[in-house]
């Protein structure tokens, strides 16, 4: 056997090169046939009416042909024939790769609520071979479940991702990424998660700055409530008591002028949205006015809790009368 060919892999729409090589030539006729065994080239002549085939080289040792705009129907065995004694035949297989036609991502719900499990589907249509789909939430890879549907040598892959969403996922992209031999670089599509969550409430003491509340001083507390959708209602209440007469409420701010010991107690900021409600408590303790010897400075105590679990407690740096919990978030 002195007739040689090489298999060809080509992407749909691109150019395939078919080469029939002869080692020891005796000027015999060489011809190239398609998978239907129709003659494409007979020596340097193309009897076949398909003008996508063009002669690249013809000599006693080689017949080299290009096939432009390759389609899936061109796939198969192409035969080189040499009219020697005995006649020789060798075949080359053209494999056509088809990248996915389009990539569609579909989220079950446009807006999800924290804690909810949502279904995200990604479909890569009509590729050959079947596409591999990978999922990412931001930079984190997730595991999906793929189903492959075959139709006429083409594959449609649908991957399903079940995703439990958290508030931190709001605005994070869910990425469907395709891996396929006909695709170079990154072929991906993404959708941004929209996650609704109940408010997170945080109280900040904006006055006095040093954080120590004494008789006769003023107190200003600001309630920060962040949620999705943004809370419409932010209200201040005094737990187990009436709000002091001299307290002034202005949106998220609470002002109490001329503090006295009767103002001691727990002040609660409540916020709500369509997902739910939350609150944060501030425990006010009014200290005696300063004596002639100034007392040591103290730090503000802030406690953040979720469902009454205290996550952080910052207390006064020295033990004693002023070491108390000041704010608790719920």
């Amino acid at each position: 056997q002195n007739l040689f060919t090489k298999d060809v892999t080509v992407i749909e729409g691109e150019v395939a090169t078919i080469s029939c090589q002869v080692n020891k030539s005796d000027d015999s006729v060489i011809q190239l046939l398609n998978p239907n065994r129709q003659t494409i080239y007979f020596r340097d002549f193309r009897p076949l009416k398909d003008s996508r085939f063009q002669l690249l080289n013809f000599s006693s040792s080689e017949l080299k042909v290009s096939l432009t705009n390759v389609s899936i129907s061109d796939e198969g065995r192409y035969f080189c024939q040499l009219y020697t004694d005995p006649p020789q035949e060798s075949y080359t297989t053209i494999t056509v790769l088809v990248p996915p036609r389009n990539l569609m991502i579909d989220i079950q719900k446009d807006t999800a609520v924290e804690g909810e499990e949502i279904e995200v589907n990604c479909t890569a249509m009509a590729s050959k071979p079947a596409t591999t789909i990978r999922w990412f939430k931001g930079n984190t890879e997730l595991k999906g479940k793929s189903e492959v549907e075959e139709w006429s040598d083409m594959y449609t892959v649908t991957s399903q991702l079940m995703l439990k969403v958290h508030k931190e996922d709001d605005g994070v992209p869910v990425i469907c990424q395709v891996e396929h031999p006909a695709v170079t670089g990154n072929l991906q599509t993404q959708r941004y998660l929209e996650v609704q969550y109940k408010p997170q409430v945080h109280i900040q003491m904006t006055y006095p700055l040093q954080g120590l509340t004494r008789e006769g001083d003023a107190l200003e507390l600001t309630c920060e409530a962040i949620g999705k959708p943004q809370p419409v209602m932010v209200t201040w209440v005094r737990v187990d008591d009436e709000m002091p007469q001299h307290a002034v409420l202005s949106g998220p701010n609470l002002f109490i002028n001329n503090l006295n010991k009767t103002d001691n107690g727990t002040y609660r900021c409540e916020a709500s949205n369509i997902v739910g409600k939350a609150h944060s408590d501030y425990m006010l303790y009014v200290y005696d006015p300063p004596t002639t010897i100034p007392p040591p400075t103290t730090t503000t105590t802030t406690t953040t809790t979720t469902t009454t679990t205290i996550l952080t407690i910052i207390t006064d740096s020295r033990a004693g009368e002023e070491g108390s919990i000041r704010a608790v978030d719920h």
Partner: antibody
Framework: QVQLVQSGAEVKKPGASVKVSCKAS????????MHWVRQAPGQGLEWMGW????????NYAQKFQGRVTMTRDTSISTAYMELSRLRSDDTAVYYC?????????WGQGTLVTVSR | SSELTQDPAVSVALGQTVRITCQGD??????ASWYQQKPGQAPVLVIY???NRPSGIPDRFSGSSSGSTASLTITGAQAEDEADYYC??????????FGTGTKVTVL
């Protein structure tokens, strides 16, 4: 230049055989198939078959299977076509033609007359 | 079917254009070849492939193809173009098949 020279006219009786020769020159004889085509008086061209001069392999038209034999002698670059069990309707001009997908060169033709 | 059909005869005035057609299934796949045969002579290849002329064939001969029909056109027919014209292609087995032939008369 390429030339195909055929043997002279033949008159044969029905049932006999005829062997027509075709001598090639001006090209590599083994490099091209040789075909045989015949034409009855006032009729069109009729393909009979081919021989691969390199291997001696043949392919005959269904109509002539069992009656035609194509051979070659590469030492003298000559192809032969023998038709046996001749009938009166085998009266025709017999041509050899070089196959370059199309027939780019033809012999001058050999008239074979079959008559009692 | 492995038959190629041609009109039996056509006539053309000297210097005018004549078109000969050849029809057959194999012509969907392959280009036809065209041969000119004058009385008492062997056929001569005049057109092959998409529209190729062997050397020595005048450029008034041209070929074209569409679907299952091949055509030979003689533009500005001359007296010496009076002859029989045969188309030729290959069947599904790769064997040659000739057309029925067209007699061209130049008036």
């Amino acid at each position: 230049q390429v030339q195909l020279v055929q043997s002279g006219a033949e008159v044969k009786k029905p049932g006999a055989s005829v062997k027509v020769s075709c001598k090639a020159s001006g090209y590599t004889f083994t490099g091209y198939y040789m075909h045989w085509v015949r034409q009855a008086p006032g009729q069109g061209l009729e393909w009979m078959g081919w021989i691969n001069p390199n291997s001696g392999g043949t392919n005959y038209a269904q109509k002539f299977q069992g009656r035609v034999t194509m051979t070659r002698d590469t030492s003298i670059s000559t192809a032969y076509m023998e038709l046996s069990r001749l009938r009166s309707d085998d009266t025709a001009v017999y041509y050899c033609a070089r196959d370059n997908w199309n027939y780019d060169y033809w012999g001058q033709g050999t008239l074979v007359t079959v008559s009692r | 079917s492995s038959e190629l059909t041609q009109d039996p005869a056509v006539s053309v005035a000297l210097g005018q254009t004549v078109r000969i057609t050849c029809q057959g299934d194999s012509l969907r796949t392959y280009y036809a070849s065209w041969y000119q045969q004058k009385p008492g002579q062997a056929p001569v290849l005049v057109i092959y492939g998409k529209n190729n002329r062997p050397s020595g064939i005048p450029d008034r001969f041209s070929g074209s193809s569409s679907g299952s029909t091949a055509s030979l056109t003689i533009t500005g027919a001359q007296a010496e173009d009076e002859a029989d014209y045969y188309c030729d292609s290959r069947d599904s087995s790769g064997n040659h098949v000739f057309g029925t032939g067209t007699k061209v008369t130049v008036l």
